[in-house]
């Protein structure tokens, strides 16, 4: 069941999921000057069964100027560089990670993808927050938000995080130490 709205916004913070529940949609958004091809789903969908989940549909962007020229899905190095470093690092880690049943990992980038990924999350999804570079995290509790269903309506829990002052960014679960559990989930990012 889709969450009715987006996760809460925290000033000077971004959020991300470490894995995406089945039913999650990722909009096929393209960077400026490009648009989604006309014959293709408007989003990718995390789908599958309890033993294996994967992203259905592929996003493809085409130049706004040359409507009929379809770009390849495989990202080129120059497009890859446009993604945030943290996300690129997560992509390289994917092969070494263990999958979480009923969840999809961060999908790889597509050529001419927009810089921000727009997800439609489902009930039960957890997203994790961290302060952006230059802000320090003051925790009053978990720096996470969960989409919950109550009385037939969905709502996101409020993350207990305030970002203030000047310091290094706080860290997401599983990122604290290099010796973290080898079966920790890959990092994946959604900026807001």
């Amino acid at each position: 069941e889709l969450c009715d709205d987006d996760p809460p916004k925290i000033t000077h913070a971004t959020f991300k999921a470490v894995a995406y529940k089945e039913g999650t949609m990722l909009n096929c958004e393209c960077k400026r000057g490009f648009r989604r091809i006309k014959s293709g789903s408007p989003y990718m969908l995390c789908t599958g069964n309890s033993s294996h989940s994967s992203w259905d549909n592929q996003c493809q962007c085409t130049s706004s100027a040359a409507r009929n020229t379809t770009k390849q899905v495989t990202p080129q190095p120059e497009e890859q560089k446009e993604r945030k470093t943290t996300e690129m690092q997560s992509q390289m880690q994917l092969a070494d990670q263990v999958s979480l049943p009923g969840h999809c990992r961060e999908p790889p980038p597509w050529e001419n993808e927009a810089t921000e990924r727009i997800y439609h999350f489902v009930v039960g999804q957890t997203v994790y927050y961290q302060c952006v570079q230059g802000y320090r995290a003051l925790h009053r509790g978990p720096a996470e938000s969960v989409c919950k269903m109550t009385h037939g309506k969905t709502r996101w829990t409020q993350p207990q995080l305030i970002c203030t002052g000047e310091t290094e960014p706080s860290q997401f679960p599983g990122e604290e130490e290099p010796q973290a559990s080898p079966d920790g989930l890959p990092e994946s990012e959604t900026s807001r």
């Epitope: 039913g23 949609m25 014959s39 789903s41 969908l45 789908t47 549909n57 439609h120």
Partner: antibody, heavy 114, light 107 residues
Framework: DVQLQQSGAELVRPGTSVKMSCKAA????????IGWVKQRPGHGLEWIGD????????NYNEKFKGKATLTADTSSSTAYMQLSSLTSEGSAIYYC???????WGQGTLVTVSA | DTTVTQSQKFMSTSVGDRVSVTCKAS??????VAWYQQKPGQSPKALIY???YRYSGVPDRFTGSGSGTDFTLTISNVQSEDLAEYFC?????????FGGGTKLEMK
């Protein structure tokens, strides 16, 4: 809560134009496409087109090209559709929809009559 | 354009029944199909996306299935509030197209 609030009913003369609005609330307006759908009794639902408020991109159903013009004002989180050179066939309820058709406005009734 | 056909304009049912509304696309649309419910004087309400996933707040008696060209919306244990018109829609390619609708009526 996500809400799409559409402008009120319109009574217009044949050959004239009408511009209706769809004000979005409860989500990031610039992140999601806004679509427009026409409904006439006995004709079901027809997709007119959509607009991405963040990039200004539009897609139109060929049938409505030159008839419908989609715009968006990000400062007020409002999408607009203008219909020109209206005939009796333009009499219908027009819905705006967003977030991959998950949310629909209440509809704007347009009546074209001399 | 992809044509979407709902061959049954009307279906009769009774409270507690199980009913299946069908929808056929003129070409392969994968699972890029949604189902909507519309009651008189109201806007369409989204029930199902991607052929089989329910939107939040939609009772689990509504089930979507199918892929390719043939799709089904099944309502098990029909309730009186389910009496409405049901539309399917393909969004696999532009222009997005809707089926003509199936009205669920009481026997």
């Amino acid at each position: 809560d996500v809400q799409l609030q559409q402008s009120g009913a319109e009574l217009v003369r044949p050959g004239t134009s009408v511009k209706m609005s769809c004000k979005a609330a409860g989500y990031t307006f610039t992140n999601y496409w806004i679509g427009w759908v026409k409904q006439r009794p006995g004709h079901g639902l027809e997709w007119i087109g959509d607009i991405h408020p963040g990039g200004g991109y539009t897609n139109y159903n060929e049938k409505f090209k030159g008839k419908a013009t989609l715009t968006a004002d990000t400062s007020s989180s409002t999408a607009y559709m203008q219909l020109s050179s209206l005939t009796s066939e333009g009499s219908a309820i027009y819905y705006c929809t967003s977030r991959n058709f998950a949310y629909w406005g209440q509809g704007t009734l347009v009546t074209v009559s001399a | 354009d992809t044509t979407v056909t709902q061959s049954q304009k009307f279906m009769s049912t009774s409270v507690g029944d199980r009913v299946s509304v069908t929808c056929k696309a003129s070409q392969n649309v994968g699972t890029n199909v949604a189902w909507y419910q519309q009651k008189p004087g109201q806007s369409p309400k989204a029930l199902i996306y991607s052929a089989s996933y329910r939107y939040s707040g939609v009772p689990d008696r509504f089930t979507g299935s199918g892929s390719g060209t043939d799709f089904t919306l099944t309502i098990s244990n029909v309730q009186s509030e389910d009496l409405a018109e049901y539309f399917c829609q393909q969004y696999n390619s532009y222009p997005y197209t809707f089926g003509g609708g199936t009205k669920l009526e009481m026997k």
